[in-house]
Amino acid sequence: QNCSGPCRCPDEPAPRCPAGVSLVLDGCGCCRVCAKQLGELCTERDPCDPHKGLFCDFGSPANRKIGVCTAKDGAPCIFGGTVYRSGESFQSSCKYQCTCLDGAVGCMPLCSMDVRLPSPDCPFPRRVKLPGKCCEEWVCDEPKDQTVVGPALAAYRLEDTFGPDPTMIRANCLVQTTEWSACSKTCGMGISTRVTNDNASCRLEKQSRLCMVRPCEADLEENIKKGKKCIRTPKISKPIKFELSGCTSMKTYRAKFCGVCTDGRCCTPHRTTTLPVEFKCPDGEVMKKNMMFIKTCACHYNCPGDNDIFESLYYRKMYGDMA
């Protein structure tokens, strides 16, 4: 969409933006829109919040269609009420080592983040906090009865998706890569980011990838077999094309998605990979974006909670698709 045509806005009045989100004109100076926030997808028509010093980072010039809202170089981070300088590392709790980079925080778990799947000898595994220990440990006792309304829809649990070995040293560079952040949507296309110095200059950089934990249209509960409470990785009947801001993937994909549970458990990506996807836009332009592809999902009781400063911030926007 270029800005040379006459301005016409949606028929409904200007949107009401959530608290702290600016109402701004789109990139064409035409219509009032809620500004996109740090880490969200942005376009010429959907600009980033200028009052927070954000800009739309389109990556390579060839991809000037869809970008990610990024803080200007050197922007500090506010995390848990504390301001950190860009480049500063800190321990958010005994569980996570974090780094601030240009307004974004990336964290690496210091505890094991494995997923334990149910087994005959341990049908209901769950993690518990033991006195005097920082990291949670798996226990196998029976779950408490939980009253749950509707399926649990967590978008992401810290998955078994690791970058280079954090202790890896290469040419005087301690290579460190944080975990991919939560997908910004519980359903539909979102984005996930991480911080790494795994590059030629050993310089910290932000990376982003598209992600889709599950399609929004799918009524996954219907597919749960009688007597079962979960559908871990629902079968997608036909290959699909991904859509991104009016552009469509050039190939079709038989992608895997995570399902839902009706008993309070969350089904989230367990193992993932990142692959490039080419999107073709209505004007013929082609752009390439990295995207998360799910290999396996896991359903577990270790759902996002507010007991940990990092986890609560990390997971909070999983609910209600505010991103």
Epitope: S4, G5, P6, R8, D11, E12, L25, G29, C30, R32
Partner: antibody, heavy 119, light 111 residues
Framework: EVQLVESGGGLVQPGGSLRLSCAAS????????MAWVRQAPGKGLEWVAN????????DLLASLKSRFTISRDNAKNSVYLQMNSLRAEDTAVYYC????????????WGAGTTVTVSS | VVMTQTPLSLPVSLGDQASISCRSS???????????LEWYLQKPGQSPQLLIY???NRDSGVPDRFSGSGSGTDFTLKISRVEAEDLGVYYC?????????FGQGTKLEIK
Amino acid sequence: EVQLVESGGGLVQPGGSLRLSCAASGFTFSDYYMAWVRQAPGKGLEWVANINYEGSRTDLLASLKSRFTISRDNAKNSVYLQMNSLRAEDTAVYYCARDTSRGSYFDVWGAGTTVTVSS
Amino acid sequence: VVMTQTPLSLPVSLGDQASISCRSSQSIVHYNGNTYLEWYLQKPGQSPQLLIYKVSNRDSGVPDRFSGSGSGTDFTLKISRVEAEDLGVYYCFQGSHFPLTFGQGTKLEIK
């Protein structure tokens, strides 16, 4: 009552300048685009310019861009048309109109102000 | 985009149906998918007033004897039963491409 009242028209010599004003009342001015449309004597309507909510984007008829400027002052609920290097063919009734920026264009019109360019 | 109206003059009797045609020199679909084709009436000695927007939507307060239709490049305004207050010059207008343009006008007059 929603109202637009134009002023500033008159007789001006070729090459001269005029600044037309349009005072709006009865609606939230900053929630609307505004526009100028003109009508030469005995002729049809011709769109001249429009301006977005806050004045950061203006669009003008290409042939008038070098001589005409549209602006607005939301604090005064007013929109303006600055006309420079006027020519005889600019003689017309100039209407101020409210542009919804959404479904329809000009849903409210002023009564118009007459500009005559003559020596 | 040139907007061509026919006829330029339309003599009618009160109570008759009137039909005005407007043809655009190219498609007037905006890049957002909407067609911004509008009809205005300018009564003698008055400012224009909006009748129809987006091809077929009546503005508030416009009697239902006015209807708009069409697509692509051909559009029509119909008045089912002409009343005395309907007399004046009717203009079609396109707002999908720059420059925004009006048709040359159709004068609806009493036979």
